[in-house]
Interface confidence: low
C-alpha cells in the first residue's frame, strides 16, 4: 500500500561507487515514504480527512494510499519513471573509463568494458 | 555543503509561545523532510515531529500535538517550529534535522536554539 | 508508544578496549514494508548528534568500521571493536519505523 522500497543508492555506500558521478552529497531523492503504521490501527489525525493521493492512487482508511504501478510514497507523489541518480538523468547511459553505466529508476547499473585499451 | 541554521536562543515567559526557525542549504529544500528533536538540559533527545517540506504533511509526536506546530516557508528554504502555551519543563535546546525518511531518519543537524522558559 | 531501553547507562572503557551498549525496544519495530528502521546516533560533548548507524546495521557516510551494530525484532546492539578517545560522548538507539519515532535513554561511554 504505498510503502514498498525501492533498492536505490545510499549516501556513501553505492553499489557502483564512482566519486566522479556521484558527488558527496546524496542525490536529492526521497524515496521512502514516511507514513509510519502504527502498530494498532491508526493514530488519529488532524490529516485523516484531507485528499491524500496523488496521481491516481486510492485512499485508504483514511490516510493511506495504495499507489498504482510506478508510484509511491505517502501520497503517491513519487514516480520511479522519472527518478535520477545524481546528475544523471533516468533511462540515460553513461560511458565511463573501463565501463558502460545506466541510470534506471535511481540506480546507476554498470557494466564493465574489459575490452577498451587499459582495461584489463 | 548541507547546512542547517537555526534561529537564535530565546527566553520566554509561561503561557507565551515561541517560534525556531531552520534555515536549510546546500541541498535540494522540498527533498528532504525536516525533524524536530528537542533536549531538556542534562537529559535525553525527544522526537517531537517531521514535515515534508515538498506538500506540507507533517507527522506529530501526540505529546505535544496539540501545542506544536510545523510550517515551511519553501521560498526561502526554511523550516518552523512553533510551540505554545509554553512551561518550564519547555526548557530545551531544539535541533531541527534533515532526513531523506529511506534510508534513515536524520542524517544532517542544525546547531541547535535554546529556549529558555521562565517567570 | 515504542519504548527504546537502553544499557548500560554509563559506559568506562579503557582505550583500545572494546565496548557494548544494547537497546531494547517494547515492540517490534520493523516497517510495514519489511524494513527495520533501528538507528545509531552519538551525540559528542557540546554538539549536535551525528548519525553512525542506519537500518540496524549500516554504517553511515564517514563513519569508522569500528562502529557495527546488529540485532534484529526488539533486540539490537552496537559494538565499537576498539574505543578511541573521540568516540566519547552519549549513544543513542532510535526506532524510525512508527510514530512517534523516538530514542533510548542513552549510554554514556566515558574514557576509563
Known amino acids: 500500500l504505498g510503502h514498498q522500497e525501492f533498492a536505490r543508492p545510499s549516501r556513501g555506500y553505492l553499489a557502483f561507487r564512482d566519486d566522479s558521478i556521484w558527488p558527496q552529497e546524496e542525490p536529492a531523492i526521497r524515496p521512502r515514504s514516511s507514513q509510519r503504521v502504527p502498530p494498532m490501527g491508526i493514530q488519529h489525525s488532524k490529516e485523516l480527512n484531507r485528499t491524500c493521493c496523488l496521481n491516481g492512487g486510492t485512499c485508504m482508511l483514511g490516510s493511506f494510499c495504495a499507489c498504482p504501478p510506478s508510484f509511491y510514497g505517502r501520497n503517491c507523489e513519487h514516480d520511479v519513471r522519472k527518478e535520477n541518480c545524481g546528475s544523471v538523468p533516468h533511462d540515460t547511459w553513461l560511458p565511463k573509463k573501463c565501463s558502460l553505466c545506466k541510470c534506471w529508476h535511481g540506480q546507476l547499473r554498470c557494466f564493465p568494458q574489459a575490452f577498451l585499451p587499459g582495461c584489463d | 555543503e548541507v547546512q542547517l541554521v537555526e534561529s537564535g536562543a530565546e527566553v520566554k515567559k509561561p503561557g507565551a509561545s515561541v517560534k525556531v526557525s531552520c534555515k536549510a542549504s546546500g541541498y535540494t529544500f522540498t527533498s528532504y523532510w525536516i525533524h524536530w528533536v528537542r533536549q531538556a538540559p542534562g537529559q535525553g533527545l525527544e522526537w517531537m515531529g517531521e514535515?515534508?517540506?515538498?506538500?506540507?504533511?507533517?507527522n506529530y509526536n501526540e505529546k505535544f500535538k496539540n501545542r506544536v506546530t510545523l510550517t515551511v516557508d519553501t521560498s526561502i528554504s526554511t523550516a518552523y517550529m512553533e510551540l505554545s502555551r509554553l512551561r518550564s519543563d519547555d526548557t530545551a535546546v531544539y535541533y531541527c534535522a534533515r532526513g531523506p525518511n529511506y534510508f534513515y531518519s536524520m542524517d544532517y543537524w542544525g546547531q541547535g536554539t535554546m529556549v529558555t522558559v521562565s517567570s | 508508544d515504542f519504548v527504546m531501553t537502553q544499557s548500560p547507562l554509563s559506559l568506562p572503557v579503557t582505550p583500545g578496549e572494546p565496548a557494548s551498549i544494547s537497546c531494547r525496544s517494547s515492540q517490534s519495530i520493523v516497517h510495514s514494508n519489511g524494513n527495520t528502521y533501528l538507528e545509531w546516533y552519538l551525540q559528542k560533548p557540546g554538539q549536535s548528534p551525528q548519525l553512525l548507524i542506519y537500518k540496524v546495521s549500516n554504517r553511515f557516510s564517514g563513519v569508522p568500521d569500528r562502529f557495527s551494530g546488529s540485532g534484529s525484532g526488539t533486540d539490537f546492539t552496537l559494538k565499537i571493536s576498539r574505543v578511541e578517545a573521540e568516540d566519547v560522548g552519549v549513544y543513542y538507539c532510535?526506532?524510525?519505523?512508527?510514530?512517534?519515532?523516538?530514542f533510548g535513554a542513552g549510554t554514556k561511554l566515558e574514557i576509563k
Open positions: 514535515n515534508d517540506p515538498s506538500n506540507g504533511r507533517t
Open positions: 532510535f526506532q524510525g519505523s512508527h510514530v512517534p519515532l523516538t
